[in-house]
Interface confidence: low
């Protein structure tokens, strides 16, 4: 003959207000005959929650259908959870003995805690922008949960990170907690369409973490690259000479045109384009006027980027006496 | 709900070898760090290996480093603990357990486990 055990596999179930908690129960032998109870608690002072001859259970369901000849599951499921419904539930078997049954074994009990899930995680940002190979800070914040063990972790594009440090409040026992991460983070050129993900997994969800995210490209500021170039070709009596402002982010850019120190007003073409990484090529020409009179001509790019201080490329134009001479429309 | 059931324990001589399996039918054992404990009779539960979600971290402890090696084949949600070179100090009923807070990359510390299988005796005796 088989020894009576008393399954429940959960030693902690935990459970949210307002959902159903389904307590498992289960049985390796059917003798000896007698019924199995649900309590909560031990010892003189335990509270009755289950018994399925007599008294009223509104709350409580059984998982298995306790009349068939052969069940061995004795679960329960208690609707409507609250917060008075939390301690440790047993289930006892009784074996049949007159007058009264008496108790014969009990499971080893399954504690009944309330949990709570965290908020979505809040990732914040460094408040000023910084530069590719320095550090920033992100912090991470999630309030609310309960239980207190919680798992968070960094990520940049999918790249687990480690240097981080968090902090998990009150350090004592609460109805709810609140963690914070921060995380430091060094940038690279091309981190324009990074992000950095903070995520949080707790038992209350079942496997699916919380995620909160930030784009790098509020954290970031590539400077640019100048280049000023003379085109060989000319139109007529006019040279163009080309500034190309190379990689940069955010798109932020004030350019001004030069003529031996003067700032020239008027207009000049220019493009912009995106590359790959999310920086940003800006490219303007300017159009010079080639006379006798004009000998030694010295143009200066300057770009401002981002509030940041100029930055300047100059070019000392070459203009021969037979480029003065031409008069077709495009010479090399 | 977290349904833990181990399997493949029995009786080995020393020397031998032994898999145990430890599988799940009510819950995503692949979403969720596994170990494998054991207790001794009169001695307290200890950790012996665990393995992250992903399967690409795994710990050991000291006395079965070399001897023993966990998997896990995340389509069968299961977690395996092959156990090689057996000796009679490894006598004990082995435990298999997730860590319901722990994910993705990380091998949790052995007192992080929350969910618990009932266990399968492992016998090493000629």
């Known amino acids: 003959e088989e020894e009576l055990q008393m399954i429940q596999p959960e030693k902690l179930l935990l459970v949210t207000v307002g959902k159903t908690a389904t307590l498992h129960c289960t049985v390796t032998s059917l003798l000896p005959v007698g019924p199995v109870l649900w309590f909560r608690g031990v010892g003189p002072g335990r509270e009755l929650i289950y018994n399925q001859k007599e008294g009223h259970f509104p709350r409580v369901t059984t998982v298995s259908d306790l009349t068939k000849r052969n069940n061995m599951d004795f679960s329960i499921r208690i609707s409507s959870i609250t917060p008075a419904d939390v301690g440790t539930y047993y289930c006892v078997k009784f074996r049949k003995g007159s007058p009264e049954n008496v108790e014969f074994k009990s499971g080893p009990g399954t504690e009944m805690a309330l949990g709570a899930k965290p908020s979505a995680p809040v990732v914040l940002g460094p408040a000023a922008r910084t530069t590719p190979e320095h550090t920033v800070s992100f912090t991470c914040e999630s309030h609310g949960f309960s239980p207190r063990d919680i798992t968070l972790k960094w990520f940049k594009n999918g790249n687990e990170l480690s240097d981080f440090q968090t902090n998990v409040d009150p350090t004592g026992q609460s109805v709810a907690y609140s963690i914070r991460s921060t995380a430091r983070v060094v940038l690279d050129p091309w981190d324009v369409r990074s992000q950095v993900i903070c995520e949080v997994a707790h038992v209350t969800l079942q496997g699916d973490p919380l995620r909160g995210t930030a784009n790098l490209s509020e954290a970031i500021r590539v400077p640019p690259t100048l280049e000023v170039t003379q085109q060989p070709m000319r139109v007529g009596n006019q040279v163009n000479v080309t500034c190309q402002v190379r990689k940069f982010y955010p798109q932020s850019l004030q350019l001004t045109w030069s003529e031996n120190g003067n700032v020239c007003q008027r207009e000049t073409a220019s493009t912009l384009t995106e590359n790959k990484d999310g920086t940003y090529n800006w490219t303007s020409w300017f159009l010079v006027n080639i006379s006798d009179q004009r000998d030694d001509v010295v143009l200066t790019c300057q770009v401002k980027h981002d509030g940041q201080l100029a930055v300047s490329k100059r070019l000392a134009l070459e203009v021969t006496v037979h480029q003065k001479d031409q008069s077709s429309d495009a010479t090399p | 709900q977290v349904q833990l059931v181990e399997s493949g324990g029995g009786l080995v001589q020393p020397g031998g070898s032994l898999r145990l399996s430890c599988a799940d039918s009510?819950?995503?054992?692949?979403?969720?760090?596994t170990g494998w404990f054991r207790q001794a009779p009169g001695k307290e539960r200890e950790g012996v290996a665990c393995?992250?979600?992903?399967?690409?971290?795994?710990k050991y402890t000291d006395s079965v480093k070399g001897r023993f090696t966990i998997s896990r084949d995340n389509a069968k949600k299961t977690v395996y603990l092959q156990m090689n070179s057996l000796k009679p100090e490894d006598t004990a009923v082995y435990y298999c357990a997730a860590d319901l807070t722990s994910h993705y990359l990380s091998c949790s510390s052995y007192t992080d486990y929350n969910s618990w299988g009932q266990g399968t005796q492992v016998t090493v005796s000629s």
């Open positions: 393995i992250s979600r992903s399967g690409s971290n795994t």
């Open positions: 009510e819950f995503r054992l692949d979403e969720y760090a």
